[in-house]
Structure formats: structure tokens, C-alpha cells
């Protein structure tokens, strides 16, 4: 029987609360054999593809998407999807990126280390199981 592709996971380093102007790296993970990872914003029309995939473990692939200098426009939800031939996976859960002012007032939250959104069971979404459109020309390591 055909195996369903496992949903990817997404995490952010150093966390999901990032000071303005600092860097953040989104890490997408999927099974062995992934050839493309895609990092999507809330709107599917804004995304970044990378074929710079590494083998995180004998059973896991990963790709990293770095934003060098975070701005307020980078705040919001992100999720991952991947292409393992011949299919695209479902999307990961959303991970919310929060951007805080560097003044660091008493109420501003600290950076959360190792924040991630792993796969959870939810209804199947097959809208990406065909070849998705080509990358929109954004650099793999630099989202915006």
C-alpha cells in the first residue's frame, strides 16, 4: 500500500521572538529523500523554495531559511511543505514569528529558544500533491 508522506515540521532558531534587525533561521524537516523544501507565509503566493537539502539523520532531511535582518514586515505565520518525488507533502503547522523593538522594555518577551511546530493529525490537504509553481526568484538563504 502507498505510504502517505509525513507532514513536515518547522522550527526557528534562536526562537520565535526576534529583536528588530537580528537574524532568524527557519528550519524545515521532513523524511529522507526530500528534494525541495518550501517556506510559505500565510498567503501561499509568498514563498521561498530551496534545493539545498541536507541529511539531518539517516531518516530525516532538513533545509534552513535565514533572514539576516528581521523587520516588522517579517512578523507573522510561517509553515513548511516539501517535494519528495513524485509528490508534494501537506503543510506543517504554522509557526508565528514575533518581532520586538530592541529597546527591550519590561513587558517585552524574551527570545524563545527552540520554538517549533511539529506534525499533528488533521484532515488531509492534497492541494500541493502536484508539482507546485517554480520558485519566485528569492534567494534560498535570504527570504526577504
Amino acid at each position: 500500500q502507498e505510504e502517505d508522506l509525513p507532514r513536515p515540521s518547522i522550527s526557528a532558531e534562536p526562537g520565535t521572538v526576534i529583536p528588530l534587525g537580528s537574524h532568524v533561521t527557519f528550519v524545515c524537516r521532513g523524511p529522507v529523500g526530500v528534494q525541495t523544501f518550501r517556506l510559505e507565509r500565510e498567503s501561499r503566493s509568498t514563498y521561498n523554495d530551496t534545493e539545498d537539502v541536507s541529511q539531518a539523520s539517516p531518516s530525516e532531511s532538513e533545509a534552513r531559511f535565514r533572514i539576516d535582518s528581521v523587520s516588522e514586515g517579517n512578523a507573522g505565520p510561517y509553515r513548511c511543505i516539501y517535494y519528495k518525488p513524485p509528490k508534494w507533502s501537506e503543510q506543517s503547522d504554522y509557526l508565528e514569528l514575533l518581532v520586538k523593538e530592541t529597546s527591550g522594555g519590561p513587558d517585552s518577551p524574551d527570545t524563545e529558544p527552540g520554538s517549533s511546530a511539529g506534525p499533528t493529525q488533521r484532515p488531509s490537504d492534497n492541494s500541493h500533491n502536484e508539482h507546485a509553481p517554480a520558485s519566485q526568484g528569492l534567494k534560498a538563504e535570504h527570504l526577504y
Epitope: 502507498e2 523524511p31 529523500g33 528534494q35 539545498d52 537539502v53 541536507s54 541529511q55 518525488p85 508539482h131
Partner: antibody
Framework: EQSLEESGGDLVKPGASLTLTCKAS?????????MCWVRQAPGKGLEWIAC????????TYFASWAKGRFTISKTSSITVTLQMTSLTAADTATYFC?????????????WGPGTLVTISS | ELVLTQTPAPVSAAVGDTVTIKCQAS??????LAWYQQKPGQPPKLLIY???TLASGVPPRFKGSRSGTEYTLTISDLECADAATYFC???????????FGGGTEVEIK
Amino acid sequence: EQSLEESGGDLVKPGASLTLTCKASGFSFSSSEFMCWVRQAPGKGLEWIACIYGGLSDDTYFASWAKGRFTISKTSSITVTLQMTSLTAADTATYFCARSCDVNYYGFDPWGPGTLVTISS
Amino acid sequence: ELVLTQTPAPVSAAVGDTVTIKCQASQNKGTNLAWYQQKPGQPPKLLIYLSSTLASGVPPRFKGSRSGTEYTLTISDLECADAATYFCQSTYYGSNGLTFGGGTEVEIK
């Protein structure tokens, strides 16, 4: 041990058709792999022809030059064929079958020893 | 259409030397590249996948690396058994196909 063996290579005349068969030993096709054909003309480099998905669907991938004249099919859980039509002298080559698996990020391994196809009048 | 251009062709080196073979891609296929070794009368043998990961049983004298669209295979401490032709290949299942480079022959002086 996992291995592949090709058969069906022959000497045929230009314009003829030929079907090559690849048989797997030690494994059966699965959703984690593709089965592929590659050819090598005498003294020349490797030329990828086509691959077919080992899972339930029959997704196929072809080199642009091979579309229309070559057909790749799974005929069982351990055999794949390559049908070739309108053969010309330029198709003279050793034809290899290879497995392309997710564990190797789709590098081709193993390969069969090859079967020789000669097109001559 | 993706084109993989291998250089140099051929290369001659002595036992114990280090040999470097390059594979220039016309498009960025990321890490989806493999290297093979082929000896006369034999099928190719997978050496490296994912541009730098050694295939099972391949000695660490073989090293793959990548910088942008340029991929490099380095063979150190060259042995007589390394005399062969080496091919790079895009392993990306997409519209550009699984193209091979033209091959680089390594001969032992």
C-alpha cells in the same frame, strides 16, 4: 543482496522496435524509489533515458529527447521494461537499468551489468 | 535544459596524488547531485550523493563539495584502482531531468 539484470538486447535493423527488460533480485519496487534506464554508446558518456516510480502510481520522467519514442513500464513488482521504437544507428549502446532510492537521495544504485543493443542494416 | 559541464578531461596523476574534478551546473540544483565511478566493461558505481555524502562502502579518500553551481569531487591519496571515468549527475526529479555530465577520465601515471 540487491541486484538488477537487463535482458532483451539484440542486433536489429534501423526502423525496428525492441523491448528491454530489467529484473530485480533481493527487493521489490516500493514507494521509496524509482526504476530507471540509462544508456552508453560505445566509448561515450552516460545518457539518462527515463525513470518510473516504484509506488502505486505510474509517474514517469523522461529525457526530452526520449519522449514519444521510448516507453517505460512496470510489468510486475520486480520487473520494468523499456520499449523503443523507430530505432536508428544512434541508438546503438549498452542499456543499463538502475534503482534510484530515497535513502541515497535518488543517486542510482545498484546498476545492472547492461545489455547491448546494436542497430545496423 | 540543465547542462552539467565536467572539467578537466582527461586528468593524469601519480599514485599518492590528489585529483580534483569539477562539475559546473547551468542551473542551481542545490545539493541534488551525485558522483559515479565507472571502469571499462563495468556499470557505474555510486560514490557520492547529496553533493557530499559518501555512499555505503566508499572510502573517505573520496570527497564531494559544492560552491553555488560548481560541484567538486576530490580524490586524495590516489591509488591504481582509482583509474576510471568519473561522472556527475543531477538527481533532481523535475522538468530538467536527471542529466549526466560528460565524464572525466582519470589515468595513473
